[in-house]
């Protein structure tokens, strides 16, 4: 008799992902030295035991605290760029810009980045025919409840200057609900953020509209601003010529606004 | 390149004790979860023992469990599985290999190496 099994909303566990976590995070033990003494087998057990044989709508943050405490890591809290529905450009600036961090660079980031998972109550089964989805199932799923931790605490983390990538050619640029709207600008330090700087990234060649005046942009200021830190804006009307320009800051076609 | 180099296998009575070897070099030892595997002659590969990049987390088959243990030196490079109370049934060749880890009994290996022989008989 074939068990009845839960049919969510959402694309199952991403094929093979026991072995793509632990290989992705030897990969990165192997880059970044200063990781080197995470035990992979140690962090996979972890990242398992968040999830496996809960109620995948009943998942907490208290669930990854075995996870987290495994993979703290210090990054240069002056150096950390947010990004809101830009994750592409966002990676790629920090590819080329070494000194900066996504929460994609680091560890715990880097293991999860593009990938479903889920289990089933009461089995030590991984749920590869479906998960929950965040708006037609449960927002207490594994998937929004590790990046809800984990961007929490990489915003709280953050100090000085923030820096934000946000997609200008989206109707919200600033979107309330996104992670970066719900989770990091409410976690952002006043005693430590000095500034929250964003940079809202063109898609169109000929817009040359001044983006930071956006009433979405303009509600993430007020809400800022009542946090007790500073808000700029800056307008990245050519985002393939601002990647170039990072890359050869010499070039003499990049004293001209980007 | 990654290389893989067993030693210390050879002939041992029932009931004696033998530790093997493996040498690692082309890669980064402490970043990957090791194990030895056995073929015991005309039988399939046989997965013995895992360890973990820093060597917290072991795994061993029932078959060896409380005979066999299995350490590593992330100083030196090296993988080691030492057998006491040996059976006839242990006579095989012991292969080390290189791996992501594993999860319960799936273990998701890289690199093997060439395998030593162990002989137990009298």
């Known amino acids: 008799v074939p068990r009845w099994r839960q049919q969510w909303s959402g694309p199952g566990t991403t094929k093979r992902f026991p072995e793509t976590v632990l290989a992705r995070c030897v990969k990165y033990t192997e880059i970044h030295p200063e990781m080197r003494h995470v035990d992979c087998q140690s962090v996979w057990d972890a990242f398992k035991g968040a999830f496996i044989s809960k109620h995948p709508c009943n998942i907490t943050e208290e669930d990854y605290q075995p996870l987290m405490k495994l993979g703290t890591q210090t990054v240069p809290c002056n150096k950390i760029l947010l990004w809101s529905r830009i994750k592409d450009l966002a990676h790629q600036f920090t590819q080329v810009q070494r000194d900066m961090f996504t929460l994609e660079d680091t560890l715990l980031g880097y293991l999860a980045d593009d990938l479903t998972w889920c289990g089933e109550f009461n089995t030590s089964k991984i749920n590869y025919q479906s998960c929950p989805d965040w708006r037609k199932d449960c927002s207490n799923n594994p998937v929004s409840v590790f990046w809800k931790t984990v961007s929490r605490r990489f915003a709280e983390a953050a100090c000085d200057v923030v820096h934000v990538m946000l997609n200008g050619s989206r109707s919200k640029i600033f979107d309330k609900n996104s992670t970066f709207g719900s989770v990091e600008v409410h976690n952002l330090q006043p005693e430590k953020v000095q500034t929250l700087e964003a940079w809202v990234i063109h898609g169109g060649r000929e817009d040359s509209r001044d983006l930071c005046q956006d009433p979405t942009i303009k509600e993430l200021e007020s809400i800022i601003s009542k946090r007790n830190i500073q808000f700029s804006c800056k307008n990245i009307y050519r985002p393939d010529k601002f990647l170039q320009c990072v890359k050869n800051p010499e070039d003499s076609s990049c004293t001209s606004e980007i | 390149e990654v290389q893989l180099l067993e030693s210390g296998g050879g002939l041992v009575q029932p009931g004696g004790s033998l530790r093997v070897s493996c040498a690692a070099s082309g890669f980064t030892f402490s970043s990957y979860a090791m194990s030895w595997v056995r073929q015991a002659p005309g039988k399939g590969l046989e997965r013995l023992s895992a360890?973990?990049?820093?060597?917290?987390?072991?795994y061993y088959a029932d078959s060896v469990k409380g005979r066999f243990t299995i350490s590593r030196n992330n100083s030196n490079n090296t993988l080691y599985l030492q057998m006491n109370s040996l059976r006839a049934e242990d006579t095989a060749v012991y292969y080390c290999?290189?791996?992501?880890?594993?999860?319960?009994?799936?273990?998701?290996?890289?690199?093997r190496g060439q395998g030593t022989l162990v002989t137990v008989s009298s």
């Open positions: 290999a290189s791996g992501k880890g594993w999860d319960g009994n799936t273990w998701y290996e890289d690199y």
């Open positions: 360890i973990s990049g820093s060597g917290v987390n072991t």
